[in-house]
């Protein structure tokens, strides 16, 4: 928890951050909560980013005041106006930049004082990967999918029933660059599995870790996949 | 001095809709927002919805969402809510208050009862 | 939503004695909380909200605490205006919500 101390006889009110991850080309939200406030009229929002000269978004007497933002943004910003009064001071982000990563700070005024609070904004690519049976291969494979991925992430293998057992020597990974020459695709191939076992393909980088489940049996084929974003801690 | 001025007691038949008013000071609706609470006879406080006029916003309890409207005229600082299909359970003493997120100044209640 | 529960529904306390109401949130609500009382046939009066802070012309005898999901009203020295409805009201999420009341009675 980070305490913005007030000056000139105002008191200092609470702000909390979560450092947080952008997908890059999607919409990222920077989250910032605040003590609610009664006098509506009175709350400012300042979201500033370390080294940018203008402001990244300020939310003044109800409106956005978007006169002193800076060029990267323009167009890009946008808080929740309903939520400004539970005290939610977060920032809508669109079409995340690889340049958008770096300290933002959210500063609050209320009627009843001043506060700040830093957040550590990471950029990358992240996607879920899919795996599936490749019928194509000569002995029984499979084969795991996801079509964005930056920074370069690893890619770990893993069995229910040979666990610990490292996959490496029997697998296969590549990294094919998309269109946009940012993001990747990711494809990682498994060869000589076997029936009756769930394996898990795994990716991850310093920004997401997503995981890939594949349960072949003889009579179905069950899949699972999740991701989860990296270093979310609040300040 | 803030006051909320709301409109008289009113009789309703089931079916049928309703509308209160709350006047407000000029200063409390450029910088608070209006909500509406109702008390039913003997029973709690039940928040409704309300409107932030410096924010353009509007906010509903989602058991009221699709019966209720709640309006705000800037230029006579008057506030409305309007609930409609009415039942006999909507017989409540109905209140606008100053605010959320709290409310630090209330109306001084509008009873509307639903009888057939 | 969140749901707010107080307790006891009644308490009989005698005048001078000291009174702590209890309000329970169903999730974490921080310190977004509003304690009002009520006397029959008026509208609710605002005594606490951020949990512990009182309202103006609030006397210093009446305190809020708690955070989180735990929340005390307590009113030290009771007087005779004192008994009434006691009730809690979470501002941290839409929609916002009150508890059911606490009736505070002359014993």
């Known amino acids: 928890l980070i305490i913005g101390f007030g000056i000139s006889g105002r008191h200092s009110i609470t702000v909390t951050t979560v450092a947080s991850a952008g997908n890059i080309g999607e919409d990222g939200i920077l989250s910032c909560t605040f003590e609610p406030d009664i006098k509506l009229s009175d709350i400012v929002i300042q979201w500033l980013k370390e080294g940018v000269l203008g402001l990244v978004h300020e939310f003044k007497e109800g409106k956005d005041e978007l006169s002193e933002q800076d060029e990267m943004f323009r167009g890009r910003t946008a808080v929740f106006a309903d939520q400004v009064i539970v005290g939610n001071a977060s920032l809508r982000l669109k079409n995340v930049q690889l340049t958008d990563a770096g300290t933002y700070k959210c500063y609050i005024i209320t009627s009843k004082g001043k506060g700040n609070a830093n957040l550590e904004y990471k950029t990358g690519a992240f996607s879920m990967p899919e795996v599936n049976v490749d019928y194509n291969a000569s002995s029984e494979t499979l084969r795991c999918e996801a079509p964005r991925w930056f920074p370069q992430p690893t890619v770990v293998w893993a069995s229910q029933v040979d666990q610990g057992a490292n996959f490496s020597e029997v697998s296969n990974t590549s990294f094919e660059l998309n269109s946009e020459n940012v993001t990747m695709k990711v494809v990682s191939v498994l060869y000589n599995v076997t029936i009756n076992n769930t394996y898990s393909c795994m990716i991850e980088n310093d920004i997401a870790k997503a995981t890939g489940d594949i349960k072949v049996t003889e009579s179905e084929i069950k899949r699972r996949s999740h991701l989860q974003l990296l270093n979310s801690k609040a300040s | 001095q803030v006051q909320l001025v709301q409109s008289g007691a009113e009789v309703k038949k089931p079916g049928s809709s309703m509308r209160v008013s709350c006047k407000a000071s000029e200063d409390t609706f450029s910088s608070y927002a209006i909500s509406w609470v109702r008390q039913a006879p003997g029973q709690g406080l039940e928040w409704m919805g309300g409107?932030?006029?410096?924010?353009?916003?509007?906010n509903y309890a989602q058991k009221f969402q699709g019966r209720v409207t709640i309006t705000a005229d800037k230029s006579t600082s008057t506030a409305y809510m309007e609930l409609s299909s009415l039942r006999s359970e909507d017989t409540a003493v109905y209140y606008c208050a100053r605010g959320g997120p709290y409310f630090d100044y209330w109306g001084q209640g509008t009873l509307v009862t639903v009888s057939s | 939503e969140i749901v707010m529960t107080q307790s006891p529904a009644s308490l009989s306390v005698s005048p001078g004695e000291r009174a702590t109401l209890s309000c329970r949130a169903s999730?974490?609500?921080?310190?977004?909380l509003a304690w009002y009382q009520q006397k029959p046939g008026q509208a609710p009066r605002l005594l606490i909200y951020g949990a512990s802070t009182r309202a103006t012309g609030i006397p210093a005898r009446v305190s809020g605490g708690g955070s989180g999901t735990e929340f005390t009203l307590t009113i030290s020295s009771l007087q005779s205006e004192d008994f009434a409805v006691y009730c809690c009201q979470q501002y941290k999420n839409w929609p916002f919500t009150f508890g059911p009341g606490t009736k505070l009675e002359i014993k």
């Open positions: 409107t932030a006029p410096i924010f353009g916003t509007t």
């Open positions: 999730q974490s609500v921080s310190s977004n």
